[in-house]
């Protein structure tokens, strides 16, 4: 806590500018008006303040806004955002996507910090659901964002938002998460034609039930092995050899290299040897 000291004569800051970098911490505390700082927050980023000086500026804003900063200030926090604690952020009410983008930009290139996680949580809760524009923004900054949500949180994602999801956004999702996302994707893409539909739905198929895989097998989709290996074992097991052959097309040749891995291993054990032999790969059930 910086002591309250009078501002020396002639040192009162008429505006936020570069001259302030020469102020000692106590001078900043005494000579910078908090209301002025709040209105000129956009200038702070352009000035090479030390971390100690930024601490003083944060302290002044905290005193001015004990209930939490207004969005007009939050949007221009810049690097001062890195000084905020999750407790500080929980007091905020961030509703503008532009504000969210501005703060995410500050943390760009780093892993998601507790501060960012709190900010996103506040923002999404404020909006009531994870809409397409928000999801677009979040996955652009954090490709693994979607897979960091619990199945319960994912249930608030409207099907329309699924259009914003890229295949790489689902790389780290587990089956429970895909179980939630797959029906939404199916709904979102339902009006697309066969081949276009498959391209879009492919990365969500880890949540697909057997009947949907059987339906896909009738559509000449040629699913690659990487996708097949991510399917739910319980969804793959009931598929016949003929259905798997149709589902994979030329990719069926890759089953041999995967014969010891799930779900291929478990599926092989469920099949009649005569049927497996038709694949021409020497698979042993």
């Amino acid at each position: 806590e910086v002591e309250k000291t009078a501002c020396p004569s002639g040192k009162k800051a008429p505006e936020i500018d570069e001259s302030l970098i020469f102020y000692k911490k106590w001078e900043l505390e005494a000579c910078v008006d908090a209301a002025l700082l709040a209105t000129q927050m956009d200038r702070v980023n352009a000035i090479p303040f030390t971390y100690e000086q930024l601490d003083v500026l944060k302290h002044k804003l905290d005193e001015l806004y004990p209930q939490g900063y207004p969005e007009s200030v939050i949007q221009h926090l810049g690097y001062l955002f890195l000084k905020m604690s999750p407790e500080d952020i929980r007091k905020w009410n961030v509703t503008s996507l532009e504000t969210l983008k501005a703060l995410l930009e500050v943390n760009k290139g780093h892993e998601m910090s507790p501060q960012v996680a709190t900010l996103i949580d506040r923002f999404v809760k404020g909006r009531g659901q994870l809409d397409k524009d928000t999801l677009d923004t979040l996955t652009a900054f954090y490709p693994g964002y979607l897979c960091s949500l619990s199945p319960e949180e994912l249930s608030s994602v409207p099907p329309s938002s699924i259009w914003a999801v890229r295949p790489q956004d689902l790389d780290t999702c587990d089956p429970r998460q895909l179980d939630v996302l797959y029906p939404k994707a199916r709904l979102a893409f339902q009006n697309m034609n066969g081949s276009e539909y498959f391209v879009k739905i492919q990365s969500f198929l880890g949540g697909a039930p057997t009947e949907d895989l059987k339906a896909l097998s009738q559509q000449n989709v040629s699913m690659d092995l990487a996708t097949f290996m991510k399917l739910r074992t319980d969804a793959v097991l009931p598929l016949t050899v003929a259905e798997v052959q149709k589902l994979l097309g030329p990719h069926v040749e890759g089953l041999k290299a995967e014969e010891r891995h799930r779900p291929v291993r478990d599926w092989i054990l469920r099949q009649r040897q005569d049927d497996l032999d038709t694949l021409g790969l020497g698979l042993q059930g």
């Epitope: 690659d224 092995l225 052959q245 030329p250 990719h251 040749e253 890759g254 041999k256 290299a257 032999d277 038709t278 694949l279 021409g280 790969l281 020497g282």
Partner: antibody, heavy 121, light 107 residues
Framework: QVQLQQPGTELVKPGASVKLSCKAS????????MHWVKQRPGQGLEWIGN????????YYNERFRSKATLTVDKSSSTAYMQLSSLTSEDSAVYYC??????????????WGQGTTLTVSS | DIQMTQSPSSLSASLGGKVTITCKAS??????IAWYQHKPGKGPRLLIH???ELQPGIPSRFSGNGSGRDYSFSISNLEPEDIATYYC?????????FGGGTKLEIK
């Protein structure tokens, strides 16, 4: 040991068809798909397609879909490739090759010696 | 389809020297690349698979490296019998594709 035997040469006239053979021995024929590869004079290798010898199901490189027809005769462990409507562009060496399925879709560990096809009037 | 761009198309080197050939895939092929030596009148001979795994009986003068889209193949201590054309093959996709080939000559 594994062997893929192909006739050395075939000479055919433009517009005709030819059926190239590849006789496999030294392994269970129906446990490995058979692939075909083309090499034009002074050019590189080009994958034509493959066939499941167990059920006779072929897959083609789109470029050869209307040119090549792949078949097998399980009783003689022989794979065939018929080339139709022959032109000078089809003059090439054609190889059959067997994949090894150690990883992914398999690389070719055994090759035939190749059949040199000459299309000329 | 995955395109494989191989370079150079030809090269000349001295006996005992070292040469390096590169293949660039049009997309990530997860190290699923093999290298072949091809001499006239014969079928191609497998040298290396899975980027750097040497086939049994192939001398350690031959080596491979790479990941993602970029791969290389080297021969050190060049010998007269190394005169041949060399090809890369991607097998990350069932529709296999070869590089254009590199013709190796000895100075």
């Amino acid at each position: 040991q594994v062997q893929l035997q192909q006739p050395g040469t075939e000479l055919v006239k433009p517009g005709a068809s030819v059926k190239l053979s590849c006789k496999a021995s030294g392994y269970t024929f129906t446990n490995y798909w058979m692939h075909w590869v083309k090499q034009r004079p002074g050019q590189g290798l080009e994958w034509i397609g493959n066939i499941n010898p167990s059920n006779g199901g072929p897959y083609y490189n789109e470029r050869f879909r209307s040119k090549a027809t792949l078949t097998v005769d399980k009783s003689s462990s022989t794979a065939y490739m018929q080339l139709s409507s022959l032109t000078s562009e089809d003059s090439a060496v054609y190889y059959c090759a067997r994949p090894y399925y150690g990883s992914s879709y398999g690389y070719f560990d055994y090759w035939g010696q190749g059949t040199t096809l000459t299309v000329s009037s | 389809d995955i395109q494989m761009t191989q370079s150079p198309s030809s090269l000349s080197a001295s006996l005992g020297g070292k040469v390096t050939i590169t293949c660039k895939a049009s997309q990530d092929i997860n190290k699923y690349i093999a290298w072949y030596q091809h001499k006239p009148g014969k079928g191609p001979r497998l040298l290396i698979h899975y980027t750097s795994e040497l086939q049994p009986g192939i001398p350690s003068r031959f080596s491979g490296n790479g990941s993602g889209r970029d791969y290389s193949f080297s021969i050190s201590n060049l010998e007269p019998e190394d005169i041949a054309t060399y090809y890369c093959l991607q097998y990350a996709n069932p529709l296999r594709t070869f590089g254009g080939g590199t013709k190796l000559e000895i100075k």
